[in-house]
Interface confidence: medium
């Protein structure tokens, strides 16, 4: 399927890379505005400047582009434990991440929220915390897996995935339970 | 003016439903993800889920997964989170929240207890 062409994509097209047509007379291309700044008025006519200004504090265009307006710059989410990287310049928008030792964990496309890396108590690192990841951790013996972290054993009850893990625990424990009934 | 008003919280019984509704206005709906936000007494906030646009992809929490469900009604202007199968562990006072780069726009919550 061919994607449907917005108006404005299609009005761009017509002219070549770095231009874009007049909205009131489609005969003129007009040069783009350069990143960091956005459109106060279209060129007059054809080989005539366009009228671009520079984005005010707290706006980007990070990218050429024929927009009215600049972008309003993104706010590092502190709800989510995130901290700023860069602050945002007239091209470019603030760059967002987690502390040291923490990673992201993406809740959609545009939201991350920082968590502490796991450190693999009772465990040992089978894959480091990634930006991205956390750290993935392999449990010593007589400890199992639980949400990212090693639990003792003692704490597996028989309903449980652990069981698979823990049962040489879980028999020893039945054995002594009936071993101190006889 | 941006608003958002929250309303549909009360007290329910474990394992219960509750249907959430946030009524939005002064913004285009449509353009915009929403978020439904929750902070439990005496904690932080926590996401709770998420409906993008367009499309209008839906995200949970693991800790609601299965049991919330996000939607929204673009002719109304209205979010919604249809909860089943509440816990205690589900007692908060729930936000809607308006992403525009940022969770710049908020409701004033709505409360919501799981108690036998």
């Known amino acids: 399927l061919v994607p449907h062409l917005g108006d404005r994509e299609k009005r761009d097209s017509v002219c070549p890379q770095g231009k874009y047509i007049h909205p009131q007379n489609n005969s003129i291309c007009c040069t783009k505005c350069h990143k960091g700044t956005y459109l106060y008025n279209d060129c007059p006519g054809p080989g005539q400047d366009t009228d671009c200004r520079e984005c005010e504090s707290g706006s980007f265009t990070a990218s050429e582009n024929h927009l009215r307006h600049c972008l309003s710059c993104s706010k590092c989410r502190k709800e989510m434990g995130q901290v700023e990287i860069s602050s945002c310049t007239v091209d470019r928008d603030t760059v967002c991440g987690c502390r040291k030792n923490q990673y992201r964990h993406y809740w959609s496309e545009n939201l991350f929220q920082c968590f502490n890396c796991s450190l693999c108590l009772n465990g040992t690192v089978h894959l480091s915390c990634q930006e991205k990841q956390n750290t993935v951790c392999t449990c010593h013996a007589g400890f199992f897996l639980r949400e990212n972290e090693c639990v003792s054993c003692s704490n597996c009850k028989k309903s449980l995935e652990c069981t698979k893990l823990c049962l040489p625990q879980i028999e020893n424990v039945k054995g002594t339970e009936d071993s101190g009934t006889t | 003016e941006v608003q958002l008003l929250e309303s549909g919280g009360g007290l329910v019984q474990p394992g219960g439903s509750l249907r959430l509704s946030c009524a939005a206005s002064g913004f285009t709906f449509p353009a915009d993800e929403m978020y439904w936000v929750r902070q439990a007494p005496g904690k932080g906030l926590e996401w709770v889920s998420s409906?993008?646009?367009?499309?209008?992809?839906?995200y949970y929490a693991d800790s609601v997964k299965g049991r919330f469900t996000i939607s929204r009604d673009n002719s109304k202007n209205t979010l919604y989170l249809q909860m089943n199968s509440l816990r205690a562990e589900d007692t908060a006072v729930y936000y809607c929240?308006?992403?525009?780069?940022?969770?710049?726009?908020w409701g004033q919550g709505t409360l919501v207890t799981v108690s036998s």
């Open positions: 409906i993008g646009w367009p499309g209008g992809a839906t």
């Open positions: 929240a308006k992403y525009g780069r940022n969770f710049d726009y």
